[in-house]
Interface confidence: low
Amino acid sequence: SGVFQLQLQEFINERGVLASGRPCEPGCRTFFRVCLKHFQAVVSPGPCTFGTVSTPVLGTNSFAVRDDSSGGGRNPLQLPFNFTWPGTFSLIIEAWHAPGDDLRPEALPPDALISKIAIQGSLAVGQNWLLDEQTSTLTRLRYSYRVICSDNYYGDNCSRLCKKRNDHFGHYVCQPDGNLSCLPGWTGEYCQQPICLSGCHEQNGYCSKPAECLCRPGWQGRLCNECIPHNGCRHGTCSTPWQCTCDEGWGGLFCDQDLNYCTHHSPCKNGATCSNSGQRSYTCTCRPGYTGVDCELELSECDSNPCRNGGSCKDQEDGYHCLCPPGYYGLHCEHSTLSCADSPCFNGGSCRERNQGANYACECPPNFTGSNCEKKVDRCTSNPCANGGQCLNRGPSRMCRCRPGFTGTYCELHVSDCARNPCAHGGTCHDLENGLMCTCPAGFSGRRCEVRTSIDACASSPCFNRATCYTDLSTDTFVCNCPYGFVGSRCEFPVGLPPSFPW
């Protein structure tokens, strides 16, 4: 698809005459008819196979034609075609005189023709105009012409369709030959493939538009070169997707178990010493005057219940003071002014006189205590649970709820670190509050008895009677050098009379 363009430039008819030689009255009001057709060796009448076009009246007798004539005419004249341009053509240009306003062929007398030119030849598609001038005895016509392709058609014959686009289906403009030229950021045959962000990982990244880098599952980062750790990985990293390699001090599948609670959380208060004792487990060793799991409680001197016989304790800056009930006196209300005759024992307690009746003692039934059996036994008062265990009263009995890492009736036992037999070469394992210790047999040393050492055979003092012991390093054995008066491998026999032999 293309357009044959004809630009009329100048028409000369100095005498103002028709082709017949008759003059126009008052002058030749000139318009043109153009016929474009297939190539003919001899241009002959017949259908204008490539198209026709007419102009309005452009001037009288001699005139120059403006680039775009007013009055509805167009210059250059357009003759569009909807086929492959063959490269050859025939062109007929007729100049006519219009006596009136009706320019239709049937409305004009046959002798209204002023001149007629016919040319034929080759014409390639291109932007350049071909200038031509045709002269007859009475007239001269100067014009130029060319063939150009319609919008979106390209190539030597205007046969190549290419429509620039910028959407899902392509991102390109068209080159003069009709080939696609991708817009920046796009590639591929139809420029549908975006060029990803520079450096975007070839395997782990992709893109749906230019300069983008979208990550495939398991990868992240601007260039999709960082792996994504296991979902839920709290304190860990990865070297390949979905891994969770724990940072120092953390453990568990999601690296969310704190193996160094003391450092990460500093749970112990009031200057206490913190010891890790397993995952999320710790022990606080309190400074004097403090108590509680985290040493968060200040000890009161009255907490130890120093006042006897129902005396009430009052804290003072420099200690405490006991307020004694009637019948008692002393620093701790330990002295009584009562005797068994006063029935001082409560809750079924039996009274026993002491010091010839000047004093007494109560023997309390189960579940009661105190000098006068006045107190119900609280089995947790004495804080029987060790290692921060929680004491729970259970009717007549009690139980300890142990913190992680401890066990036993009173939480007195560490959950044994020795259970997995960590000591090598027959070493003896000892559970400590913060870990374990190996006692190694002779010939071994190191934290786990893993280091072999030479045996000092004299270490066990095998020589008697102040003999000197020497170690033979080559055989790991000892030699005793006996003092005067002793013999034997260990200098164990005193020298006496010669032994009496039985022969």
């Epitope: 686009r165 910028n166 959407d167 899902h168 817009l183 920046p184 950021g185 538009k209 300069a211 983008e212």
Partner: antibody, heavy 125, light 110 residues
Framework: EVQLVQSGAEVKKPGASVKVSCKAS????????INWVRQATGQGLEWLGW????????GYAQKFQGRVTMTRNTSISTADMELSSLTSDDTAVYYC??????????????????WGQGTTVTVSS | QPVLTQPASVSGSPGQSITISCTGT?????????VSWFQQHPGKAPKLMIY???NRPSGVSNRFSGSKSGNTASLTISGLQAEDGADYYC??????????FGTGTKVTVL
């Protein structure tokens, strides 16, 4: 001027179907997507689906799958949205919106940049 | 059908800045840079204000800006003006090749 002009208001009975049309002008109809969005009185926007006028491909919201059909007629640059098995919950203003790809410094972006005036669909017995 | 969560209302005095949030999931807001913001005045069709997280169509004031962090996108209106009073909706592309809108935020200029 790029414009989307929608068909007029519709009143339908429960169980019936409604077809809303959207005529595009001022741009190449097949170059951009058409989205359909609805809004019940006093409520927010709810996306129904998209259609590619060039290929006819569609993408529907899961909620409307099996009940909505989006079609087009490229010769007259018109997109249609048909919703079947109507209930009173489908009473809303239905909008078509062009899904346009922008270009900026070699990058390409998507936005629902031009909207129709809206079509009121009332479902009542 | 999932929706993106927005605050029901936000207000500010003329000249102030306000920010509207839009929270989704890694399958929509967090997974793509395809977040748009729309302004809607009563009785009118929505108007595109921001596309692809932080891009403004021509004709939209540079007082409107967008951003995104993780699964949350934000629209900021600076130098608030009376005509900014309207409903605002966010929208995002999702991993199932669909779009989803936010619950909407009413902006009141005091």
């Amino acid at each position: 001027e790029v414009q989307l002009v929608q068909s007029g208001a519709e009143v339908k009975k429960p169980g019936a179907s409604v077809k809303v049309s959207c005529k595009a002008s001022g741009y190449t109809f097949t170059s951009d997507e058409i989205n359909w969005v609805r809004q019940a009185t006093g409520q927010g926007l709810e996306w129904l689906g998209w259609m590619n006028p060039h290929s006819g491909n569609t993408g529907y919201a899961q909620k409307f799958q099996g009940r909505v059909t989006m079609t087009r007629n490229t010769s007259i640059s018109t997109a249609d949205m048909e919703l079947s098995s109507l209930t009173s919950d489908d009473t809303a203003v239905y909008y078509c919106a062009r899904g346009h790809y922008y270009e900026s410094s070699g990058y390409f972006f998507y936005g629902m940049d031009v909207w129709g005036q809206g079509t009121t669909v009332t479902v009542s017995s | 059908q999932p929706v993106l969560t927005q605050p029901a209302s936000v207000s500010g005095s003329p000249g102030q800045s306000i920010t509207i949030s839009c929270t989704g999931t890694s399958s929509d807001v967090g997974g793509y840079n395809y977040v748009s913001w729309f302004q809607q005045h009563p009785g009118k069709a929505p108007k595109l204000m921001i596309y692809d997280v932080n891009n403004r169509p021509s004709g939209v004031s540079n007082r409107f800006s967008g951003s995104k962090s993780g699964n949350t996108a934000s629209l900021t209106i600076s130098g608030l003006q009376a005509e900014d009073g309207a409903d605002y909706y966010c929208s995002s592309y999702t991993s199932s090749s669909t779009y989803v809108f936010g619950t909407g935020t009413k902006v009141t200029v005091l």
